[in-house]
Each structure stands twice: as structure tokens, then as C-alpha cells.
Interface confidence: medium
């Protein structure tokens, strides 16, 4: 039985050209995390494997940095980075848990006047 829950930063915003940390946390389970995948709507960003470390997708090598922890740092943001991001936790023995984050990348002037989304 899967008892765990994924806590995420939820809906977040960041400024164009800046960076953002995508973070998920698995709680309420004693299952062992074997791997975490970070995905955008239709592609893989990175993998963190408990034994082998990090794999950054070649398309994102210049803009994605591992961590902190199991999180992911997205750099040099563009408006095209706006959208859904998913953290997929592979665990044993529970199976797979998925968390969702929505990122809105704002033009600098908009961001200066306050983001529409706040980290809960």
C-alpha cells in the first residue's frame, strides 16, 4: 500500500533570465527512494539515481544544475520554460510517486511588480 505523499513548491514564478529551484519532498513513507526523474511536459530534464548520481539530459546540459538535494536548478530562464514540471519518485517497495509544479516565467518588468504565484 502506498502511504507516501509528495510535497512540492506548487505554483511558482521566476524572472526571465534568472534561475529557479524545483523541489519536491516525499514524506509519510519509509520506502527507499531509488531514483528521482525530473520531467517537463514532454521531455526529460534530469535523473538522480541513488547509486549512480545525476544524469542531465543532453538538451539541458547548459541550463540545468543538479540539486540542492534531489531538487533541480533551472537557469537562464526563458518565457518558453513556462509550464508544468514533474518530479517522479521511484521507490521500493511502494512504487512510483509523482509531484507537479507549475512554473511561470515572467518578463522582468512584470516580475518586479510582484509574481502572480507564491510558494506555499
Amino acid at each position: 500500500m502506498m502511504t507516501g505523499t509528495i510535497e512540492t513548491t506548487g505554483n511558482i514564478s521566476a524572472e526571465k533570465g534568472g534561475s529557479i529551484i524545483l523541489q519536491c519532498h516525499l514524506s509519510s513513507t519509509t520506502a527507499q527512494v531509488t531514483q528521482v526523474n525530473w520531467e517537463q511536459q514532454d521531455q526529460l530534464l534530469a535523473i538522480c539515481n541513488a547509486d549512480l548520481g545525476w544524469h542531465i539530459s543532453p538538451s539541458f546540459k547548459d541550463r540545468v544544475a543538479p540539486g540542492p538535494g534531489l531538487g533541480l536548478t533551472l537557469q537562464s530562464l526563458t518565457v518558453n520554460d513556462t509550464g508544468e514540471y514533474f518530479c517522479i519518485y521511484h521507490t521500493y517497495p511502494d512504487g512510483t510517486y509523482t509531484g507537479r509544479i507549475f512554473l511561470e516565467v515572467l518578463e522582468s518588468s512584470v516580475a518586479e511588480h510582484g509574481a502572480r504565484f507564491q510558494i506555499p
Epitope: E39, I47, N49, H55, H90
Partner: antibody, heavy 118, light 107 residues
């Protein structure tokens, strides 16, 4: 345990397109655990990685073959495919499909010998 | 592109002996990104070692991997008749490359 099986023609004419399909059993091709890749081996020679696809559709190809390669996934059939265009005799090889953890290839098909000849 | 050079090209040994196969990279490779495979005639390669030193599922403990940086080694402590085959190292940097292979033959 994953099992992979290649299928497709064993003979392709020069300048035509080589097409192969890999059927995955014992697991879902939609698993975020794996990449699905193609590797080839010319007769009597070593191994060359062609490319891979992630279940969400993102691909990555060997730069030396990139202009001629297309890898696609069909989740409804639990299959992925390889197309290599404008083939020459140098593309004659055993073509393997394999699953990859992103670091290494853990499960392999038995291989499909494709000969390019008129 | 990282080039992997395996040596020797051919290794002739007898069953019961110890085999040491070398794989040298043209630039430093993370240990996580180095694997070894065994291939017998007419068969697909089989994963032996990943992460430079971790044995894959079902691989006997006579197979061991070691090394870091640019120099990696596959050791077969006591050769069995079924171990005579071709061995390849493979790395993942920004793309996958394989060594040219070492043929392990019966002396």
C-alpha cells in the same frame, strides 16, 4: 524481466531507408525508468550507439548519424522504432535494440542483421 | 567525444587463470558512467559491470571492476570455459561510446 525483440527486413537497397521495430515485453515502454536505444555492430567489428528515446518522446542521437536517424515510440503497441535514411554498404550491421538506465544498457534484443546491397 | 582504448586486443589464457582487461579513456570519465559487457559469438552483449565496480544482476562474483579517472580494469579471478568471449567497455559522457573490444581466447 524485460525482453526486447527486433523485427524488420534483412536486406535494404542503397539510398533507401532502413526501418526496424523493437517490441518490448515484461514491462511497459511508458516506464520513466528507462530509455529505449539502438546500437549497431558491423560484421566482425565493435559496437556503435545510434540513439535513444525517452517514453515522453524526447530523443538523443549519435552526432555522426543524427542527420539520417529517427527514433520513435508507440506506447499503444509497447514498441519503439528506428529509421535510418540514405543507407550505404557501410550501414550493413547487426542492429540491436536495448533498454538503458541512462548510464548503461541492461537488456538487449537478440539483434537483427541488416545487409545493404542492391 | 571520449575515446575508449582497450588492451590487449587479444588475451590468450587457460581456464583457471586470472584475466585482467584494461580500458583507457581519452579524458576523465565519472566512475558512474563506466560499464563492461561480455559478448559471445552470435549473441547480444550482456551487461557485466556498471558504475565501474558494481556487478549486474546474476553476474558471478569472479567478475570484478575497478578504476577511476581514465583507467579502468575488468578482472576475472578464475576463468571458466564459458568466460571466453569478447569484452567491451562503455562510457556515458555526453554520448555513449564503446571500446573496440578485447577478445579473450583459450590458450
Amino acid at each position: 524481466q524485460l525482453q526486447l525483440q527486433e523485427s524488420g527486413p534483412g536486406l535494404v537497397k542503397p539510398s533507401e531507408t532502413l526501418s526496424l521495430t523493437c517490441t518490448v515485453s515484461g514491462g511497459s515502454i511508458s516506464s520513466s525508468r528507462y530509455f529505449w536505444g539502438w546500437i549497431r555492430q558491423p560484421p566482425g567489428k565493435g559496437l556503435e550507439w545510434i540513439g535513444y528515446i525517452y517514453y515522453r518522446g524526447s530523443t538523443y542521437y549519435n552526432p555522426s548519424l543524427k542527420s539520417r536517424v529517427t527514433i520513435a515510440v508507440d506506447t499503444s503497441k509497447n514498441q519503439f522504432s528506428l529509421k535510418l535514411s540514405s543507407v550505404t554498404a557501410a550501414d550493413t550491421a547487426v542492429y540491436y535494440c536495448a533498454s538503458s538506465s541512462a548510464w548503461y544498457f541492461d537488456y538487449w534484443g537478440q539483434g537483427n542483421l541488416v545487409t545493404v546491397s542492391s | 567525444e571520449i575515446v575508449l582504448t582497450q588492451s590487449p586486443g587479444t588475451l590468450s589464457l587457460s581456464p583457471g587463470e586470472r584475466a585482467t582487461l584494461s580500458c583507457r579513456a581519452s579524458q576523465s570519465v565519472s566512475s558512474s558512467y563506466l560499464a563492461w559487457y561480455q559478448q559471445k559469438p552470435g549473441q547480444a552483449p550482456r551487461l557485466l559491470i556498471y558504475g565501474a565496480s558494481s556487478r549486474a544482476t546474476g553476474i558471478p562474483d569472479r567478475f570484478s571492476g575497478s578504476g577511476s579517472g581514465t583507467d579502468f580494469t575488468l578482472t576475472i579471478s578464475r576463468l571458466e570455459p564459458e568466460d571466453f568471449a569478447v569484452y567491451y567497455c562503455q562510457q556515458y559522457g555526453s554520448l555513449y561510446t564503446f571500446g573496440q573490444g578485447t577478445k579473450l581466447e583459450i590458450k
